[in-house]
Amino acid sequence: SERCDDWGLDTMRQIQVFEDEPARIKCPLFEHFLKFNYSTAHSAGLTLIWYWTRQDRDLEEPINFRLPENRISKEKDVLWFRPTLLNDTGNYTCMLRNTTYCSKVAFPLEVVQKDSCFNSPMKLPVHKLYIEYGIQRITCPNVDGYFPSSVKPTITWYMGCYKIQNFNNVIPEGMNLSFLIALISNNGNYTCVVTYPENGRTFHLTRTLTVKVVGSPKNAVPPVIHSPNDHVVYEKEPGEELLIPCTVYFSFLMDSRNEVWWTIDGKKPDDITIDVTINESISHSRTEDETRTQILSIKKVTSEDLKRSYVCHARSAKGEVAKAAKVKQKVPAPRYTVELACGFGAT
């Protein structure tokens, strides 16, 4: 066959679908690789061809579109399963071609099983809700295109294993689930089950997402440096190890980049000749507020090092702050015998 632009196996789009449920999978070529859509390609006389490689096989084979009840079908740039079976797992390829042009991409499709509480190996999207916000909604995801707008599906919402009914602050509203004055106890996995009829059959779509309640922007503050502070003085003798922790609290802020760094005499540690190491640790509160600690360490400090300025800096979307550590050289303890001798006028 003539040369074909092969985009390879697109593992970025690891598609997971539930067993025994409908699945509609768009050819990724038009979404991520080509600059034109399916309609344009079709008008230009290009044909979309589908084939697949079964799990643990090397052989590419055509997809059987003649199964009973059209279990697998193609509609424009969409491959349909009505419904999926476990052994549909494999790598699927869509190829767009005519006599002079060819482009193709493969992607993995995994059909997964779920238990009666909707637990499965499915990777779950995470939806963040602000704590104590008035009304926030999540929407049953990825159900567009499965049924026409004239069909009115039934939607049932679950938290974990339990059907959501008479929950005080979680209210099902069709495709939406509303949270009123969210609390941390609203954290968890929420599942919508969408049931709709098609050609005398009943299909179910199961969609699970993880809700994480996070700090509210109304409570957000600029970074707070807990250490270094004015109460602690790092007093060292030359030759000792100098350890200075920089501990910073960051309020949760959606999409904020939290940064902590040290400067020594106004320069980044990488830009100076001192043998300094910096170790960072990060911890999170239940509402995803963040505490970052960067420990600056100089194994054998010199008297020159003890005269330098050590400043901890922190930055978030809320602002930038800095705090200098109080570092000084320890005054040597008086040598007892000499002091005593001088005191008695000995020569």
Epitope: E132, G134, N169, I181, I184, S185
Partner: antibody
């Protein structure tokens, strides 16, 4: 100093209505969820209703759902409880309280007595 | 809703003695539990939150412990002003619910 001052209580007949107010001072009222809590004579405490700091989210105890409406006016630093279709069992001292997700009700008003009787 | 059960209903203690009040939740409330003190004719006052953190201005003789479903309020040495009714309350789930109260009276 945080202060919460309730008013609007009184004697009302069954089926009647009453509107309670709670004037807040000494803190940024618009930054806090607020609640109403009641206490029937000689009985324990019962949470009645809560409202989010912007006023868009409201929650109610099952015992008052559909009859009571909580609201707030952040420009006036005031919390309200509109009570309709009152019943004898609604007789109680009604407290307004500042509500925090991490500490419960940290400040309370002195309460206002509502008596539902014919 | 989460049911909070306090015991005992009444506790008779002599001044200077130790008082231990219990509170049990019908399901886990993590450490989202508060204790309040109420004296006759007064509004409740927050004593303990987060199951064990004393609120501002609360004397050190008041301490709280527990997590999940079992909680305790301890008053190490009762003063005359401590004789009152004590309520536990969970704020883990809406609706926030209170225990029925424990009355601490002079023996």
């Amino acid at each position: 100093e945080v202060q919460l001052l309730e008013s609007g209580g009184g004697l009302v007949q069954p089926g009647g209505s009453l509107r309670l107010s709670c004037a807040a001072s000494g803190f940024t009222f618009s930054a806090y969820t607020m609640s109403w809590v009641r206490q029937a004579p000689g009985k324990g405490l019962e949470w009645v209703s809560a409202i989010s700091y912007e006023g868009d989210g409201t929650l109610y105890a099952d015992s008052v759902k559909g009859r009571f409406t909580i609201s707030r006016d952040n420009s006036k630093n005031t919390l309200y409880l509109q009570m309709n279709s009152l019943r004898a069992e609604d007789t109680a001292v009604y407290y307004c309280a500042r509500s925090l997700y991490w500490s419960g009700f940290d400040y309370w008003g002195q309460g206002t007595l509502v008596t539902v009787s014919s | 809703e989460i049911v909070m059960t306090q015991s005992p209903a009444t506790l008779s203690v002599s001044p200077g003695e130790r008082a231990t009040l219990s509170c049990r939740a019908s399901q886990s409330v993590s450490s989202n539990l508060a204790w309040y003190q109420q004296k006759p004719g007064q509004a409740p006052r927050l004593l303990i939150y987060g199951a064990s953190t004393r609120a501002t201005g609360i004397p050190a003789r008041f301490s709280g412990s527990g997590s999940g479903t079992e909680f305790t309020l301890t008053i190490s040495s009762l003063q005359s002003e401590d004789f009152a009714v004590y309520y536990c309350q969970q704020y883990n789930n809406w609706p926030w619910t209170f225990g029925q109260g424990t009355k601490v009276e002079i023996k």
